[in-house]
């Protein structure tokens, strides 16, 4: 089952998404599709990267971590009620049948008529380690753009780094729900 | 316009070797498909356009070998161990994500004593 | 592994008429990653719908597909003399490829 993301209209959708590269800038290809990974490769392909740089992208997509060391979650721009579905990350491994994918849920919620202060802003002043986009895109930051360093020894979504962690509980509480399939 | 052609194909003794190959751009993703006389489709094996990423039916792994040579528009199917059930007609053809929209006219392999 | 069942083995029409080609899939098929096929005797399978329901390139429009989840359904509105011929059905959403074993079409 799909790890689910809940974001609201307007705002900027994150999907987690990491690997760590073998050593510092042997980058492996990374596609992201809209549609859950089918058995090759990334359908819908809205970004893609390859062993240097991202080689491929859509309006309102990007990659707002440092893709050269791993980090290939994805942002979505300004979404709408369209955006919800499954997305597909895929980390291309080279070799036989060595390719990682993840399959992400994405559910959009209508944005609130009164827009109330939430945890959320604690969350982000508890780790101010801000994440901005790398090659391309506008520069800014976003709701859950602030993430705690992570020791990744193992390809991942972030959902698998979070598992029984106090900082799942706290984007729980904060409205960005996560539930580990 | 998308042009595949496959060539290797021809008789085999059982336990012997043949290599099949397919005209493809280097930009092409290709598999291997094949169809035994009066039967259905049997995916074989599937190749990124780079040549890093490589996928096998269980029915021919460590039998069967796909490769490329982008310099050389070619992608090939190096079979060893053949059986007479792997008689059949051996299409390549172009596919990104599983699906595929060309296809060679195919080979006919016959593994027979 | 994803097991296609099609139905039925056999559909004997006449030009004109409609004809409704049926793959069962053991499991759901996951963001409706099927395509269907058309072969004639001798000749290499021709794409006619990936997706389920979208049209490859070149197809008229009276092959239509549909469906999702498990059951997905070809349709040819109004058969043509070279329309007649072997159709499979092929899943791409999980490992390995399967496809159908296949549905022929052939003249009253």
């Known amino acids: 089952s799909e790890v689910e993301y809940r974001a609201e209209v307007g705002q900027n959708a994150y999907l987690p998404c990491f690997y760590t590269p073998a050593a510092p800038g042997n980058l492996v290809p990374v596609c992201w599709g809209k549609g859950a990974c089918p058995v090759f490769e990334c359908g819908n392909v809205v970004l893609r990267t390859d062993e240097r740089d991202v080689n491929y992208w859509t309006s309102r997509y990007w990659l707002n971590g440092d893709f050269r060391k791993g980090d290939v979650s994805l942002t979505i721009e300004n979404v709408t009620l369209a955006d919800s579905g499954i997305y597909c990350c895929r980390i291309q491994i080279p070799g036989i049948m060595n390719d990682e994918k993840f399959n992400l849920k994405l559910v959009i919620k209508p944005a609130k008529v009164t827009p109330a202060p939430t945890r959320q802003r604690d969350f982000t002043a508890a780790f101010p380690r801000m994440l901005t986009t790398r090659g391309h895109g506008p520069a800014e930051t976003q709701t859950l753009g602030s993430l705690p360093d992570i020791n990744l020894t193992q390809i991942s979504t972030l959902a698998n780094e979070l598992r029984d962690s106090r900082l799942a509980n706290d984007l729980r509480d904060s409205g960005a729900t996560i539930r580990i399939g | 316009q998308v042009h595949l052609v496959e060539s290797g194909g021809g008789l085999v003794k059982p336990g012997g070797s043949l290599r099949l190959s397919c005209t493809a751009f280097?930009?092409?993703?290709m598999s291997w498909i094949r169809q035994a006389p009066g039967k259905g489709l049997e995916w074989l094996s599937y190749?990124?356009?780079?040549?890093?990423?490589?996928y096998y039916a269980d029915s021919v792994k460590g039998r069967f070998t796909i490769s490329r040579d982008n310099a050389k528009n070619s992608v090939y199917l190096q079979m060893n161990s053949l059986r007479a059930e792997d008689t059949a007609v051996y299409y390549c053809?172009?596919?990104?994500?599983?699906?595929?929209?060309?296809w060679g006219p195919g080979t006919l392999v016959t593994v027979s004593s | 592994e994803i097991v296609l069942t099609q139905s039925p083995g056999t559909l004997s029409l006449s030009p004109g008429e409609r004809a409704t080609l049926s793959c069962r899939a053991s499991?759901?098929?996951?963001?409706?990653?099927l395509a269907w096929y058309q072969q004639k005797p001798g000749q290499a399978p021709r794409l006619l719908i990936y997706?389920?329901?979208s049209r490859a390139t070149g197809i008229p429009d009276r092959f239509s597909g549909s469906g999702s989840g498990t059951d997905f359904t070809l349709t040819i509105s109004r058969l043509e003399p070279e329309d007649f011929a072997v159709y499979y059905c092929?899943?791409?959403?999980?490992?390995?490829?399967?496809f159908g074993p296949g549905t022929k079409v052939d003249i009253k």
């Open positions: 053809a172009r596919g990104r994500i599983g699906f595929f929209d060309y």
């Open positions: 280097s930009d092409y993703y």
């Open positions: 190749i990124s356009n780079s040549g890093s990423i490589i």
């Open positions: 499991q759901s098929v996951s963001s409706s990653y």
């Open positions: 997706g389920a329901s």
């Open positions: 092929q899943q791409y959403g999980s490992s390995p490829l399967t």
